[in-house]
Interface confidence: low
């Protein structure tokens, strides 16, 4: 009977710790399911929030060509308002650029014709004038598109054309021969020769934008 | 006996149901931990996300505003006529003209007035540069719209607006005092203190017309 | 920083060659022409022709003409000087220098011809 | 070929002194005259370039002047690091020619 009693009491205890373990159980099943809902819930948000960063990131690029084309327009609209770009001299018919970097004939001419420019070209007393006027405040040697290949050989301009006799006088190494050829640069409103691989500034010219505004 | 062996086995029973339920509850705490690692990751995901968003609705805002800028731009220069005369330069807001006589400070001041323009007044480093650089082959001296009365004074641009001090060192006769006044020239880069009645070149400057026609 | 830096000294025998080379850094290399100039013993400066590493062209002085000849290598960045026909009166420092006016030097390279 | 003549070819002074070197070319060469300083065993140094244009990182006591055919270098307060010898070039033809030198010695 003392046997029977301490059985009976030790399963009233297991019973009681049952219970309470299943009332553990169904708490923690019904926190799960509360936990898996928030889960999806965080999902869903995730998703959500991804869409929309895709969705701006789509805008973003829109916007960010839109940016594009218009600063495009804008430089083609300025340039085609404007009879000369930024930095440009506008004369007469032409723009003129005085580099700001000393370089010799030919790379000269490289950096003109990047900004779709060429040599100085001297066509008339006018321009020569402008010119000569243009750099009075400087001692040094601009390049011109003017070149021979040996004494020889004519002055020609980069376009092909012969320099017209009574424009200017050639002086310093006319006679000289150079490997890189003859170049004629300007300077204090003379004009000279001398090799071409000799690094000088340099005046590039192009047509202004004279078209109707 | 019989109800001792019958407790007995309902305590084993009971023992056994324990133990599992306790084994579930230890399943369902390892699966809840998990769980609740995987919902702070999520979270920290989302963290990341709105981030993220933000930062591209602020990006997206600036080029918007960009946009919109470029578009009034785009409006104003599209009915732009030449920013500036023959002869100048264009550059940003700005027209300049480098003068091709040497004269004194007043002389050049009146030079450019005569011109609807003041003498140079540099108001940033941008401007500076610019400067400097199209001043590169001179070794020449150029007045700007610069001057003080004596070294008491403050220097002051023409419009009366005073000099900002991280612009540039004025070198040269700072400390001295002329009748005609100080004043200010840029040669080679660098800006010196002169007596005005000096004669120098001298650079013109007005604001370029980007305005709607 | 731009830097000339020349081959070493040489001693040569009369009627030999002798080729000294100068390579350039700090800067762009075909950017710019490099000049020969030599300096006898006790005496002045003589300046014998340059060469522009773009294009590969070159100006001698006439008393060297068909006895010198001026090269380069761009993707070395280094430009060379050949004396040919070597005399007794070639002994000198022959400097390399970068453009004109002359910026920048070589340490020099003495040649020492002697029988 | 453009002939340059130095003058003095010798020169002494002191420190603080000011001294002056002329060149002269063979005919007018439009400011293309450079001044190289050299000390023994050393390349050329570039002073003045363009006549009178200084080289960055030269003392302001160097200066140079002329025009046409007549050129001058001149140093305002001589410092003991200057004794070396001095050369003009011309480099408006080819060939570009030296002037023989002008040494500067302590006196």
């Known amino acids: 009977s003392q046997v029977s009693n301490l059985l009976k009491q030790q399963q009233t205890n297991l019973t009681h710790q049952k219970n309470k373990l299943e009332g553990q159980i169904s708490a923690r099943q019904q926190a799960e399911e509360a936990s898996q809902e928030s889960q999806n819930e965080l999902k869903e948000m995730i998703e959500t929030l991804a869409w929309k960063l895709n969705e701006k990131s789509k805008e973003q690029m829109e916007l960010h060509h839109q940016n594009l084309n218009l600063q495009e327009t804008l430089k083609r609209v300025a340039n085609c308002s404007a009879p000369c770009p930024q930095d440009w001299i506008w004369h007469e018919e032409n723009c003129y650029l005085f580099s700001t970097g000393s370089f010799n004939w030919e790379k000269s001419q490289e950096k003109c014709l990047s900004l779709d420019a060429k040599l100085l070209k001297i066509n008339s007393t006018a321009d020569l004038d402008f010119i000569q006027q243009a750099i009075s405040y400087s001692s040094f040697p601009f390049w011109m598109g003017l070149s021979r290949r040996n004494p020889s050989y004519p002055w020609l301009w980069e376009d092909g054309s012969p320099l017209m006799p009574h424009l200017f006088r050639i002086r310093g190494a006319v006679s000289q021969t150079y490997p890189s050829g003859t170049c004629a640069y300007i300077q204090r409103g003379a004009v000279y020769a001398e090799n071409c691989i000799l690094a000088a500034f340099s005046i590039c010219q192009k047509k202004a934008n004279l078209r109707a505004q | 006996s019989q109800v001792s062996n019958l407790l007995k086995q309902q305590q084993t029973n009971l023992t056994h149901q324990k133990n599992k339920l306790e084994g579930q509850i230890s399943a369902r705490q390892q699966a809840e931990e998990a769980s609740q690692e995987s919902q702070n990751e999520l979270k920290e995901m989302i963290e990341t996300l709105a981030w993220k968003l933000n930062e591209k609705s602020k990006e997206q805002m600036e080029l918007h505003h960009q946009n919109l800028n470029l578009q009034e731009t785009l409006k104003r220069v599209a009915n732009c006529s030449a920013p500036c005369p023959q002869d100048w330069i264009w550059h940003e807001e700005n027209c300049y003209l480098f003068s091709t006589g040497s004269f004194n400070w007043e002389k050049s001041q009146e030079k450019c007035l005569s011109l609807d323009a003041k003498l140079l007044k540099i108001n940033s480093t941008a401007d500076l540069d610019f400067i400097q650089q199209a001043i590169s082959y001179s070794s020449f001296p150029f007045w700007m719209g610069l001057s003080r009365r004596n070294p008491s004074y403050p220097w002051l641009w023409e419009d009366g607006s005073p000099l900002m001090p991280h612009l540039f060192r004025i070198r040269g006769a700072v400390s001295q005092t002329y009748p005609s006044g100080t004043c200010a020239y840029i040669q080679r880069g660098a800006v010196y203190a002169e007596n005005c009645i000096l004669a120098a070149f001298s650079i013109c400057q007005k604001k370029a017309n980007l305005r709607a026609q | 920083q731009v830097q000339l830096v020349q081959s070493g000294a040489e001693v040569k025998k009369p009627g030999a060659s002798v080729k000294v080379s100068c390579k350039a850094s700090g800067y762009t290399f075909t950017d710019y022409e490099v000049h020969w100039v030599r300096q006898a013993p006790g005496q002045g400066l003589e300046w014998m022709g340059a060469i522009h590493p773009g294009s590969g062209g070159a100006a001698y002085v006439q008393k060297f003409q068909g006895r010198v000849t001026m090269t380069r290598d761009t993707s070395i960045s280094t430009a060379y000087m050949e004396l040919s026909r070597l005399r007794s009166d070639d002994t000198a420092v022959y400097y390399c220098?970068?453009?004109?006016?002359?910026?920048?030097w070589g340490q020099g390279t003495l040649v020492t011809v002697s029988s | 070929d453009i002939q340059m003549t130095q003058s003095p070819s010798s020169v002494s002074a002191s420190v603080g002194d000011r001294v002056t070197i002329t060149c002269r070319a063979s005919?007018?060469?439009?400011?293309?005259l450079v001044w190289y300083q050299q000390k023994p065993g050393k390349a050329p140094k570039l002073l003045i370039y363009?006549?009178?244009s200084l080289q960055s990182g030269v003392p302001s006591r160097f200066s140079g002047s002329g025009s046409g055919a007549d050129y001058t270098l001149t140093i305002s307060s001589l410092q003991p690091e200057d004794f070396a010898t001095y050369y003009c070039?011309?480099?408006?033809?080819?060939?570009?020619?030296f002037g023989q030198g002008t040494k500067l010695e302590i006196k």
């Open positions: 070039q011309q480099y408006l033809i080819t060939p570009y020619t």
């Open positions: 220098a970068r453009w004109l006016p002359m910026d920048y």
């Open positions: 363009a006549a009178s």
């Open positions: 005919q007018g060469i439009n400011n293309w």
